[in-house]
Amino acid sequence: VKMAETCPIFYDVFFAVANGNELLLDLSLTKVNATEPERTAMKKIQDCYVENGLISRVLDGLVMTTISSSKDCMGEAVQNTVEDLKLNTLGR
Amino acid sequence: EICPAVKRDVDLFLTGTPDEYVEQVAQYKALPVVLENARILKNCVDAKMTEEDKENALSVLDKIYTSPLC
């Protein structure tokens, strides 16, 4: 998904939460220097995904992928790319 | 930078009502099975997380959005 390129750490954390993988979540949260209370909070969200099973995780992953690849987001990504190109051109 | 639609989705997941969150999801995926699942997850998070937990989760999101990796 193109949007993952714009904020990879967000998608790392989201998919670690939705996956139910505690180790992966810890690794992702370390990258943003999350405190212990912050980790506890994120694990509570992860618990909900785990408790509701695989189908629940797949469906919510589908929602995030759909939003991320929607015109609302892709339009945003295109706009950002255009602005980056302008800046690069001016920089030269 | 994170897409505003994604940011709104996550914010409502943590701070919105179940209706507000599911209505937002419905704008992108209006399938009953998806929307019921979204409500179940939202209800679970609301039941498990204290206000302090939610503030901590929002704090993680702030760190994510301001990270060089975003």
Partner: antibody
């Protein structure tokens, strides 16, 4: 918060008509399917009718088909149940209920209910 | 129409008891099943949907399970506020149907 208020119930003779209303507030009315569910005195629950969020589809329980009509006015946040050719067996408390899930979620899960209005069909 | 059958019709229990109500469908309804609680003179209240999903504000002592044709509602530790009538309801079709109800009364 979600509030549903039914009105229009009363005592009516068999064969006559009655129109029930349900005024809704506290949510995005035009996003949700709306239902009528009834309960005869001392009995269980029976779903009566549904109207989709945009009014495009309507479904009824077999026993009221051709006699009852569900409708909605999204500008006034109100749904109606027009009941014609009433029978003694239609005597019940009629509840207005909102679908739990919006838009495509006209799945008949009754997330919110009104307090009900009593319809008595008797000569 | 799909017929829903609840058992028992009446259940006598004490505060603190674990209570289980069963609901059977005449044909498979997958996981499209909801449970409601109703107190005398009041409208029903949604407890559980999609067989096991707890509705907002419903205490964790309520839980639902099952799929296909057999479902259960469990109250892990009955509280004074839980004495009421409980209904299951299938929504696999656009003609939803309810069970006949199970009254949970004080022993």
């Amino acid at each position: 918060q979600v509030v549903l208020v039914e009105s229009g119930g009363g005592v009516v003779q068999p064969g006559r008509s009655l129109r029930l209303s349900c005024a809704a507030s506290g949510f995005t009315f035009s996003s949700y399917g709306m239902h009528w569910v009834r309960q005869a005195p001392g009995k269980g629950l029976e779903w009566v009718a549904v109207i989709w969020y945009d009014g495009s589809n309507k479904y009824y329980v077999d026993s009221v088909k051709g006699r009852f009509t569900i409708s909605r006015d999204n500008s006034n946040n109100t749904i109606y149940l027009q009941m014609n050719s009433l029978r003694a067996e239609d005597t019940a408390v009629y509840y207005c209920a909102r679908s739990l899930i919006p838009v495509a979620g006209t799945d008949p899960i009754f997330g919110y209910w009104g307090q009900g209005t009593l319809v008595t069909v008797s000569s | 129409d799909i017929q829903m059958t609840q058992s028992p019709s009446t259940l006598s229990a004490s505060v603190g008891d674990r209570v289980t109500i069963t609901c059977r469908a005449s044909q498979s309804v997958s996981s499209w099943l909801a449970w409601y609680q109703q107190k005398p003179g009041k409208a029903p209240k949604l407890l559980i949907f999609k067989a096991s999903g707890l509705e907002s504000g419903v205490p964790f002592r309520f839980s639902g399970s099952g799929s296909g044709t057999e479902f259960t509602l469990t109250i892990s530790s009955l509280q004074p506020d839980d004495f009421a009538t409980y209904y299951c309801q299938q929504y696999n079709t656009y003609s939803p149907t309810f069970g006949q109800g199970t009254k949970v009364e004080i022993k």
